[in-house]
Each structure stands twice: as C-alpha cells, then as structure tokens.
Amino acid sequence: KSSNEATNITPKHNMKAFLDELKAENIKKFLYNFTQIPHLAGTEQNFQLAKQIQSQWKEFGLDSVELAHYDVLLSYPNKTHPNYISIINEDGNEIFNTSLFEPPPPGYENVSDIVPPFSAFSPQGMPEGDLVYVNYARTEDFFKLERDMKINCSGKIVIARYGKVFRGNKVKNAQLAGAKGVILYSDPADYFAPGVKSYPDGWNLPGGGVQRGNILNLNGAGDPLTPGYPANEYAYRRGIAEAVGLPSIPVHPIGYYDAQKLLEKMGGSAPPDSSWRGSLKVPYNVGPGFTGNFSTQKVKMHIHSTNEVTRIYNVIGTLRGAVEPDRYVILGGHRDSWVFGGIDPQSGAAVVHEIVRSFGTLKKEGWRPRRTILFASWDAEEFGLLGSTEWAEENSRLLQERGVAYINADSSIEGNYTLRVDCTPLMYSLVHNLTKELKSPDEGFEGKSLYESWTKKSPSPEFSGMPRISKLGSGNDFEVFFQRLGIASGRARYTKNWETNKFSGYPLYHSVYETYELVEKFYDPMFKYHLTVAQVRGGMVFELANSIVLPFDCRDYAVVLRKYADKIYSISMKHPQEMKTYSVSFDSLFSAVKNFTEIASKFSERLQDFDKSNPIVLRMMNDQLMFLERAFIDPLGLPDRPFYRHVIYAPSSHNKYAGESFPGIYDALFDIESKVDPSKAWGEVKRQIYVAAFTVQAAAETLSEVA
C-alpha cells in the first residue's frame, strides 16, 4: 500500500485524496483552453502555450517548472506555393486539381495559421506518371502486387489508403517498390462509420477532410540531424543527405472527394479480392494508369514543402520525492498538434494538467510523494517524437540510473466504449488492482468497477476473467523511454469497440475537424471518460511514486516470455526441413525462459517476506525491480535499428504502431523462404535466438539473490 512517510494525510486516504481531487469539469475547461487556436510545433502559438503551461504548473504547486528547448528538423508547406495533385491531359494541361485546404469547421472560418494538409518531411518534386492503387501499402499488399499480380510499381505514382499501419511504413514500402510518388487518402471504409453523420453533425470524416502526419522512418532516432544526441546549442548536425529516416519521394495526403476523382478513372488490373475494395463508388482497379478513354491522362504531383531547423520547447515539471528523490516516475504527453488538437493531443494534455493540479493540491496540504514525479509537456511529437527523444537523449545517464517508470499521456480518448491499456508486463498487476478500485463510467455498469466493464467489453484472449492488455509498439512519446532506455512504461486511454468499428483510429484524426466541439458534442459530453482516464493515468503515477515496494510483478514477465517463445517457435516450425538442415534449436531460449520463471517466482517470495523497515534491503529489492526492464536492453540494438534496443519488444518493422515480441528473431524469420542465401538467413535466425536466450537469462540473473 501507499507510504505515509513525509505526509500529514493518512495512508489509506492518500490515493483517495488524489483521485477525489480530479474533476471532469476542470478537464473540460482545460481542453477548451488548449484548443482555440492551432499549436503546430515550431510556431509562436505553441511556444506561448508552453509558457502558459509552465506558469500554471508553478501555480499548481510543483517545485520547479523549466522549459527545455532544442533545435530540430521540422517540415512545413510553402505558404505561397501550395502543394496539390493534378490530373493532366496529353498536352500537360491540368484538368483536375486536388484541394488546397480543408473547408474550415463552423466557427473557425476566420482562424489564421491553419496548416493545410501535407505529409511532413516529403521532399519537393513534381513527378508525373501513371497511377497504381496499392491498397493499404502494407508489406503484404506489395507482395500481392509484385509476386502474384506481376505489377511493377517502378516509375509509377502509387495511391494508398490510410489505415492498418503507420503511414511512414507505407511510404518506405512504396520507395522499395520503386515508386516515384505516393498519394495517401482516407477511404470511407476506414474513416466513415456506418450510421453516423460527418462533422459538424457527427464524428465521421467529411469528403474534404484530410489526415496530416509525418512520413519518417526514424526507428527511434529522434531529430533526423542529431541521432543519439540532443539537438542543443553546440550540436553537430548531419547534412540533409545523411539525415535519418527522410523519405526520398514526394508524398501528399488527400480526402475521399479528391480520391474519387483519381480512382474513378483507374484501369488495368481488377482488384485481386474484396479486401482491396473500399467504400467509394469506384472500381478499385489497380492500374497501372487510367482506363481506355482516359489512358493518355497522367497524374502529376506538385510538392513544395521545406525542411527547416526550428526551435521546440518541452515543459518539464518536478515534484520532488520526500524519501527517494533520486527515483523518477514520469508522466508525459505532447502539446503540439496538427491543427486544433481536440483529441490529439489536448484531450491528453488536459488530463495531465488536472493530474498536476491534484498533485499540487496535495503538496500544498503538506504531502509529498515518496519518489520524485516528473511531468512533461512534449513538443514536436507529431514530427517524429522529437521533443521527448531529445530530452531523453540529453538526460539519458540520469534516466537509465534513476528512471522507475514512464506513463504516456497522449489522446485520452479514441472512442467511448471501453478502456485500452498497453504496457510492460511489470505493470499488469498494478493496472488490474487499480481498475478494480475505480468506478466504471460505462452505461449499464453503474456501481460496478472499471475492471469489470473493461473485462466484459475487452476480454483477454488468453486468460478468462481478465481484460486485454496489449504490447507497447511505438508512434508515441514512450518510445525512447521503453524501446531505447528500458524504462518500464505504460499508456491508457478510452477506445472504440474494435469489433463493430473496423475503421483505423478515429475518423477525424489529424484533420481540421478535431475540435473541442467534436469531443464535447459527440465523444464525451460529461467528460466522464476523460475523468476515468485521468484516474487511471494519475492512479498509476501515484502508486509508482508512492508505494513502499514498487508495484511491479516480475512473474507476469515470465508468463509472457513463455507465450512469446511459443509463438516465435511456432513461426519457425513452419519451416521444419530448414530447421533440421541448419540445426536451428530454440532449446536455449526455452531454457532461459524456464530459468527466468523459477527465479522470478523465488524473487516474488522474497519480496513478500523481507524486512520492509530496513531501508537498505528495501532499496535493494526495489532496484532489482526497477532495473529488470533495463536488463532486457541490448546495448548494440536490433539489426539496422540501433535505437530499438529492447530484446523482448520493438515496434514492428512493418507497422511502427504495433509491438512485436522477440523482434530480432521475428525479423530474421520474416519472408525467409524468399531469401537468396538460405544458409546465411538461417544463420541470422540462430544468432537472434542466441541473443534472445542470453538476454532473458541475463535478466533472470538480475533477480537472483545478490550474494
């Protein structure tokens, strides 16, 4: 239970006092305040908001609040030379042009500095050519095109629908296929839920709405010009040709009205199957090129965006711990938005603001947490997780020695159906115990716990009576803390019903229509889901910062390690002959997992029994728990991805948003049947099994008795 050291509030009321202080009305008020104008990274408006948050966090009672600035590579459209795509006739005349901006939402017609839709970090260019429709531009979509349909994308402009995977992976795949340009569009099949009106009458995407977003493939590098090191005043910057992760071909996003005009003329091959058809009234022909009557027409892209080194600002607030000030629990979320940020990020930032206010209220009453809590308002998340990554690079030595946990706080909602949690297995028990103590906000679950409604609506696929908790992937600010530094991390938000809503993300994601009104009218009028998310995020931070013994259960890691080992073994066993030929064995991995399980079990027994009044022993046991996540870090990183260093989890090489388990082995096995040198390929599988087995065994030994 929570500590009562250095406090005048009795232990059982500590958490309750904190949770009771959180108010839905305040979150609503903060959300309104944060969403009236755009807060694009690198702009004066976002700098002003940083200073406002700094000032308010000081007022709330934090011990110190500082701005941490960095000069990083950002990307903006050219204000006088707009980006667009044309259909051109045989004479080169533009007979159709895509829109230059989204129709502004009601009440926002006179707002200035709304950045038009663009793909951040697209190079400049004006390629023209035939169009090829590539579905979601996933790895498997290009396999289908190239291997089964024998369609060559080389020299073509590809058009891909948003959804399923991170847009940067789509662009990477298109580049590898030889495309000379990429058009990204939102298909109603993915961004228009049946039976719901489009904004402003509902939460669906209108035909003129467009999803912005970066198209980098940074693999955890942070600022493309200063990988591994902070982009500070004396930074050495790479030349643009050596920058990390920049796309090499022009890319531009459009809405479905414009997509209709491009896709309706498509000829060539029919779609291979129904999974390639969206909801537009077009044939979804793959191409290449337009059909008979229009075969002389081409598509031309006009992209004039520029990459610029620009100053960004994180806000870092500190609430010093009373007992272990050198142990840090971090709550962080970003502040920068593409436009108004009604959901992303300000529904999260408003929750962080209220959590800070509540902690500040307790502090003013004489309470302090056991451990130090750091609060962060990150900048330039939308441009590649830049603010968080640069700060972590600057403070990496402190973080790797002192970092207990990181809780992410981007969008609080992506729906209003049930809770969604992604976290390290170390936090499973914390999340379970906390949600059992919180009230469910869901209709039909009055008087029931959050755990109960969550478990009912989102059951675990493996364990009956338990809720689903997912692996951490990436695409958000926890990345550097978890994947690079090995700090136990978690995230929570309210989500949609994935079974009935098959669209990707939420329909208005990264569009101009992500406004305060979207949230207040359609998603959470009472802000009860926001309050619940505040209780979950804040409650996790409270327990992590205040429990005498860290609320980590290493036995849950043992369970998932066995599950992941079984899964990767079964993938490998799809090639039984090759495994025999090349003497591929998983014995070392299963043995390491078995050892981990036994040692974790014994550690947990000792954890129950040790003398918690002995501060040295307490600190020793807590350090073993804190450093367990760190023990899964391989200092050499994953192949070709040096900043993804966690051996158990990494963002999928095919979808940055998704987490992959035993990623080194998984990637070595992926498409292995197509490798030109099978002996070398299976040798790499064996090496990755060795690395994984060693890492699991080494991690296990950190839990053994110290002497």
Partner: nanobody
Framework: EVQLVESGGGVVRPGGSLRLSCAAS????????MNWVRQAPGKGLDWVAF????????YYADSVKGRFTISRDNSKNTLHLQMNSLRPEDTAVYYC????????????????WGQGTMVTVSS
C-alpha cells in the same frame, strides 16, 4: 440571414466586358463551391460556371469557355464572374448559387440563390 446578392449587371455592346459580383452573408463562403447560372428571356436555367471552395478547380459551360472567368475572394465573402467578348446570346439574368455540399469537388445541387442581375448585350 443567409443570402446572396448579385451586382454588376448592365447593358453592354457585343465584344464588351462586364464583371459581376456576388456578396454572401449569413454563411461562410469559404466552405462551399459556388456557381453562376443564367436564364435568358423566355428560356430555362443554364449553368455557366463553377468554382470549388478553395479555388483549385473551375469548370465552365462550353458556350462561355475562354471568355468567362469565375473567381472568388473568401476573405471578403465574395464571388466574381469576369465576362469578356460578350455576345447577344449572353443576354440573361445571372444568378449566383451556393453548392449544397461542403467541400464538393464538382458542381452538385444548389441550395441558396441570389435574386439575380440582368445582363443585356446589344448594339
């Protein structure tokens, strides 16, 4: 009150020019495609020109292509029609009409009309 008010009509000799304007009030012009439509004496309505909400696309009836130019100033909530090389058959009442669908990329149905301005081309 939602309304469109046309102006700029008049009498002009063949080969002459006129510039029609249409002022919108009560709704944001910036979100909608806009049309010019005309009705010659004793005839039905004829669509003349369309401009998308953002000005990225302009479409014209074959009879006016190369002579008429549709434009807009969203900051002033106004629509224009520059008419050059006017012919007697261009004589008509000219109406501006708002497109029904926010963000439409091609002309759709109209839902708000002006009262019209008379253009007479005569020697």
């Amino acid at each position: 009150e939602v309304q469109l008010v046309e102006s700029g009509g008049g009498v002009v000799r063949p080969g002459g020019s006129l510039r029609l304007s249409c002022a919108a009030s009560g709704f944001p012009l910036i979100s909608y495609g806009m049309n010019w439509v005309r009705q010659a004496p004793g005839k039905g309505l004829d669509w003349v020109a369309f401009i998308t909400y953002d000005g990225s696309n302009r479409y014209y009836a074959d009879s006016v292509k190369g002579r008429f130019t549709i434009s807009r100033d969203n900051s002033k909530n106004t629509l224009h029609l520059q008419m050059n090389s006017l012919r007697p058959e261009d004589t008509a009442v000219y109406y501006c009409a708002k497109d029904r669908i926010v963000g439409a990329r091609v002309p759709d149905a109209y839902d708000i009309w002006g009262q019209g301005t008379m253009v007479t081309v005569s020697s």
